[in-house]
């Protein structure tokens, strides 16, 4: 299920006075599109331009991250008079043009979404016939990818003074809440580290001192689901054996 945020309370602009007789360059994209990891999403983009009845060669491009300079994730080219835009680039084969650029529509479908796809995308069109012109969305559409929690790492590590600590790292969007349970613990939120810059979907919780042998379980939960993983601590002759 894909949700498109068409309006935002931060938008101060609302009243059209009257329509203009001539078209100018502009691109219309929603501020945000939301979809779940594993699903597909459609990034809408339509445009207007000042070159009436342009029928020459054109190129449609989508970038990720930043306008003008961000890496291209999709590119296709249409020959003069053709409505077929031949794909020249589709990153990992997951990007497909849904719209018809000849009809001012650059809408893109993204398949098999992953959390790493959560970023801004910018559409661009280039004319290269009798007219040489191009335009790119400055503001882009934010693709918000949601995902149920997944524990990506759970481990026991040595600490100073022959002690042990446990680490649990999970990913998800919204970022999951982590809780530890285990011998003499009950349920403990432990020390949860905030998502790190550049790792916005990862959350780590540390259990700083494991005082008893036994099974320690990390639970990650968000609005989309929950996930658990366990680690076992057995101390013999001052050493540790751990399995998950």
């Amino acid at each position: 299920f894909v949700r498109t945020k068409i309006d935002t309370t931060e938008n101060l602009l609302n009243t059209e006075v009257h329509s203009s007789p001539a078209q100018r360059w502009s691109m219309q994209v929603p501020p945000e599109v939301s979809a779940e990891a594993g699903d597909a999403a459609v990034l809408p983009c339509t445009f207007t331009h000042p070159h009436r009845h342009y029928d020459g060669p054109l190129t449609a491009i989508w970038r990720a991250g930043e306008p003008y300079a961000g890496p291209q994730v999709f590119r296709c080219a249409a020959a003069r008079g053709s409505e077929l835009c031949q794909t020249a680039l589709s990153l990992h084969g997951r990007f497909r043009l849904l719209g018809n650029p000849r009809r001012n529509d650059l809408s893109l479908r993204v398949e098999r979404l992953a959390l790493a796809d959560d970023r801004r995308y910018f559409c661009r069109v280039e004319f290269a016939g009798d007219v040489h012109d191009r335009y790119e969305s400055r503001h882009g559409v934010r693709l918000h990818v949601t995902a149920a929690p997944r524990i990506v790492n759970i481990s026991v590590l040595p600490s100073p003074a022959h002690a042990f600590r446990a680490l649990c790292t999970a990913e998800g969007e919204p970022p999951p809440a982590l809780a530890w349970s285990g011998p003499a613990l009950g349920n403990s939120l432990a020390a949860v580290r905030s998502p790190r810059e550049g790792h916005g979907h990862l959350v780590t919780a540390e259990l700083p001192a494991l005082t008893h042998d036994g099974r320690y379980t990390c639970t990650a939960a968000n609005s989309l689901g929950r996930s658990e993983a366990s680690v076992y601590l057995f101390r013999f002759h001052g050493a540790s054996g751990a399995s998950t």
């Epitope: 931060e10 938008n11 101060l12 602009l13 059209e16 006075v17 009257h18 329509s19 203009s20 100018r24 360059w25 502009s26 501020p31 000042p50 991250g65 930043e66 306008p67 003008y68 300079a69 801004r120 012109d133 191009r134 335009y135 790119e136 400055r138 503001h139 934010r142």
Partner: antibody, heavy 118, light 107 residues
Framework: QVQLVESGGGLVQPGGSLRLSCAAS????????MTWVRQAPGKGLEWVSF????????YYADSVKGRFTISRDNSKNTLYLQMNSLRAEDTAVYYC???????????WGQGTLVTVSS | DIELTQPPSVSVAPGQTARISCSGD??????ASWYQQKPGQAPVLVIY???KRPSGIPERFSGSNSGNTATLTISGTQAEDEADYYC??????????FGGGTKLTVL
């Protein structure tokens, strides 16, 4: 409410440096391009610089290129303008403004005065 | 360089219609916006995308763009509309330009 507040202006000698700040509130700062615009005494508005959401993309007017640096700290909701090698002709009120989605400036700060004089 | 040209001044009697023009090649391809600035105050957006009005701006403000000339029209001009008005336009990427400004005097 949506608000931008500039600070950091003052009197500086030619060749000197100054750093302007613009504190944003009432909106999701990281969702918007931001800009600096200046106005010399008795003159018109002059666009100075743009910065994209993340700060990775920046643009400058020719008159300040190589001397001014725009930056932002999204965690602090703050926009900056580092001005080096200042000249008398840089004397102006400096405004920060938010760029709306239709490529115009829909929210402005009250401005901060920079005077370059010996 | 991109340039937008405005008349330095326009005068209008109260209740009459004021028209302020702005011309430049960029306006053939890109939208115009208009800003009102009163003495000692920051500019305020009054028109964007040639003819759209932000919320809170009175209906007497309207805009149009034909060929390479954008026009700001103030119908039934009031004394409080006396101000400097600047047209502006983006171009494809990094360029942004303001017109030289027009001082509107309400007689």
């Amino acid at each position: 409410q949506v608000q931008l507040v500039e600070s950091g202006g003052g009197l500086v000698q030619p060749g000197g440096s100054l750093r302007l700040s613009c504190a944003a509130s009432g909106f999701t700062f990281s969702n918007y391009w931001m800009t600096w615009v200046r106005q010399a005494p008795g003159k018109g508005l002059e666009w100075v610089s743009f910065i994209s959401y993340s700060g990775s993309t920046t643009y400058y007017a020719d008159s300040v290129k190589g001397r001014f640096t725009i930056s932002r700290d999204n965690s602090k909701n703050t926009l900056y303008l580092q001005m080096n090698s200042l000249r008398a002709e840089d004397t102006a009120v400096y405004y920060c403004a938010r760029e709306g989605t239709s490529s115009m400036f829909d929210v402005w700060g009250q401005g901060t005065l920079v005077t370059v004089s010996s | 360089d991109i340039e937008l040209t405005q008349p330095p001044s326009v005068s209008v009697a109260p209740g009459q219609t004021a028209r302020i023009s702005c011309s430049g090649d960029a306006l053939r391809s890109y939208y115009a916006s208009w800003y009102q600035q009163k003495p000692g105050q920051a500019p305020v957006l009054v028109i964007y995308d040639d003819n759209k009005r932000p919320s809170g701006i009175p209906e007497r403000f309207s805009g149009s763009n034909s060929g390479n000339t954008a026009t700001l029209t103030i119908s039934g001009t009031q004394a409080e509309d006396e101000a400097d008005y600047y047209c502006a336009s983006f171009t494809y990427m990094s360029d942004f330009v303001f017109g030289g400004g027009t001082k509107l005097t309400v007689l």
